[in-house]
Structures are given as C-alpha cells and as structure tokens.
C-alpha cells in the first residue's frame, strides 16, 4: 500500500531573467527513493538516480543546476518557462509518486537573481 505523500512548492512565480528552485518532498513512507525525474510537461529536464547521480538533459544543461538535495534550480528564466513541472519519485517497494508545481514567469523591468549558484 502506498502511504507516502508528496509536498511541493505548489504554484510559484519568478521574474524573467531570474532563478527559481523547484522542490518536492516525499514523506510518510519508509520506501527507499531510487530515482527522481524532473519533467516539464512531457519534456525531461533531469534525472537524479540513487546509484548514478544526476543527468541533466542536454537542452537544459546551461541553465539548470541540480540541487539542493533532490531539487532542481532553473536560471535565466524566460516567459516560455511558464507551465507545469513534475517531480516523479520512483520508490521501492511503494512505486511511483508524482508532485506538480506550476511556475509563472513574470515580465519585469528589473530581473532579480535569487539563486546562489553561477554557471560561467
């Protein structure tokens, strides 16, 4: 029986050009997390595998950084990044848990850079 629950950041907004951290948290289960997939609509952004580490999709490599933890940081946001994001937790023995986050990227005359990581 699947007893776990996914807590997400829910509906969030960020400014164009800025950064945002997407985070989900699996609780209320003793199941082992074997992999977390991050998807945007039907597009794979990243995979975090317990044995193999992180894989960032090539098309997102320059503006996505893994973490903190199992989260994902998006930077240099554009209005095209507006939409649904999904964290898909693969666990044993429970199976799959899915969380949803809706991100709205807002136009702004001054883009604030919130995240503390840099990609040269």
């Amino acid at each position: 029986m699947m007893t776990g629950t996914i807590e997400t950041t829910g509906n969030i907004s960020a400014e164009k050009g800025g950064s945002i951290i997407l985070q989900c948290h699996l609780s209320s289960t003793t199941a082992q997390v074997t992999q977390v997939n991050w998807e945007q609509q039907d597009q794979l952004l990243a995979i975090c595998n317990a044995d193999l580490g992180w894989h960032i999709s090539p098309s997102f490599k320059d503006r996505v950084a893994p973490g903190p933890g199992l989260g994902l940081t998006l930077q240099s946001l554009t209005v095209n990044d507006t939409g649904e994001y999904f964290c898909i937790y693969h666990t044993y023995p429970d199976g799959t848990y899915t969380g949803r986050i809706f991100l709205e990227v807002l136009e702004s005359s001054v883009a604030e850079h919130g995240a503390r990581f840099q990609i040269p």
């Epitope: 807590e7 951290i21 948290h25 699996l26 609780s27 003793t30 997390v33 977390v36 975090c48 595998n49 317990a50 193999l52 580490g53 992180w54 894989h55 960032i56 490599k61 320059d62 996505v64 950084a65 893994p66 973490g67 903190p68 933890g69 199992l70 940081t73 995240a115 503390r116 990581f117 840099q118 990609i119 040269p120």
Partner: antibody
C-alpha cells in the same frame, strides 16, 4: 569502486595560497556535486562549498567566498580547491566528498594544511 | 542559513546500551537531513540519508527518524566500533550546513 584521492599534507606561510586536488575514479565525475568540508583539530565539520562538473555550477558558504575557489578539470576527473591569503585559522584538514542528491556518500581521506611562519 | 543544533555534546554509554542522538534545525527542513559517523583520524561516513533511509553496508542497528525541525539518530545496542563523533547535515537549502556533533564515548 568509487575513490576520492586527495593531495598530501601542505605547509604554507601566512599570506600564501595553496591549491589542493581531489581525483575521482570509479564513477561518472560529471554526475555528482563535489563538496569541500573543513575540519579544524578537535572541531566539527564546516561546509565550504560545492562544484558541479556537469556544467560548472558552484555554491559557496558566504564565509568562504573570497577565501576558497572551486574548480575542476572534467577530462582528468579532478576537482580543485584554492585557498588564498592564508592565516592560522586556515590550518585544518580539508575533505572532498561527492553528492548525487542522496547525501555525501563517499569522502576523500582528507588533506592537511598547516599555516605557520 | 539553517543552523543545526546537536545534543548532547557528549554521550557516555556502555556497550549494549541503546542510545538516541538529537539534531534540531532552526527552521523546517522537511526530511532533508543526513547523518554521518566519524571515527578518530578517519573521514566521515554516511549512515542515514533523508532522515530515515538506510544506507547499504551500514548495520541495521542504526536508524533515523524525524521531520521538520526535530530529528533523532538511534543506535540499538551500541557496539565498541560505534564510538566516535556523529554529525547531522541538511540539504534542504544552500548553503548546506552541519551540526556541531555529538561525541559517543565509552562510559
């Protein structure tokens, strides 16, 4: 087998800089964060920062910005940390550790830095 | 930055005793807490990930619990090889931080 091999003991003068390495083997270097952790004699663990070789992303503890610089050469599966303007407070053991989202599951053996005039 | 406070600073026990070590966060970190063991003159070793998830190769006498701000590492029937330092660490947000540690010593 995953291994993180660190530089040996370093003795440096106050005001000098040192650059230490952490050579990784047994896994995909670009798929894991490389963290650096400081431990003064008889003290706890202090997180310095982390470098992600997959796209050169970095995160620093604000306390170590300007003190530590993290880099890597992916072709050699080696991470580096340079410490500048050394003082006695920088005398410590420095560990590298890898993290792929599930805790820091492998650690180097530690590199000792002694700052003395 | 998130501050992790470990207690007690030192715990004196006899082999065979069962013990609990505490780690308290200055704000909610959900379950993003990991536990490490460090023996004298050795590198730290990951014991528990995400508050309660076990690590391959770690004896089953080690277990973790907690969520939000209060976390516990339990050792069921301490063995002589368990003596040393124990640290908690959070990965909920940058910068990552460690607790000050608990020293487990022989009574």
């Amino acid at each position: 087998e995953v291994q993180l091999q660190q530089s040996g003991t370093v003795l440096a003068r106050p005001g000098a800089s040192v650059k230490m390495f952490c050579k990784a083997s047994g896994y995909s270097f670009t798929s894991y964060w490389m963290h650096w952790v400081k431990q003064r004699p008889g003290q706890g663990l202090e997180w310095i920062g982390a470098f992600y070789p997959g796209n050169s992303a970095t995160n620093y503890n604000q306390k170590f910005k300007g003190k530590a610089k993290l880099t890597a050469v992916t072709s050699a599966s080696t991470a580096y940390m340079e410490l500048s303007s050394l003082t006695n407070e920088d005398s410590a053991v420095y560990y590298c550790s890898r993290e792929g989202g599930y805790g820091m599951d492998h650690w180097g053996q530690g590199a000792s830095v002694t700052v003395s005039s | 930055d998130i501050v992790l406070t470990q207690s007690p600073a030192t715990l004196s026990v006899t082999p065979g005793d069962s013990v609990s070590l505490s780690c308290r966060a200055s704000q909610s970190i959900r379950n993003n807490l990991h536990w490490y063991q460090q023996k004298s003159h050795e590198s730290p070793r990951l014991l528990i990930k995400y508050s309660s998830q076990s690590i391959s190769g770690i004896p089953s006498r080690f277990s973790g619990s907690g969520s939000g701000t209060d976390f516990t590492l339990s050792i069921n029937s301490v063995e002589t090889e368990d003596f040393g330092m124990y640290f908690c660490q959070q990965s909920n947000s940058w910068p990552y931080t460690f607790g000050g540690g608990t020293k487990l010593e022989i009574n």
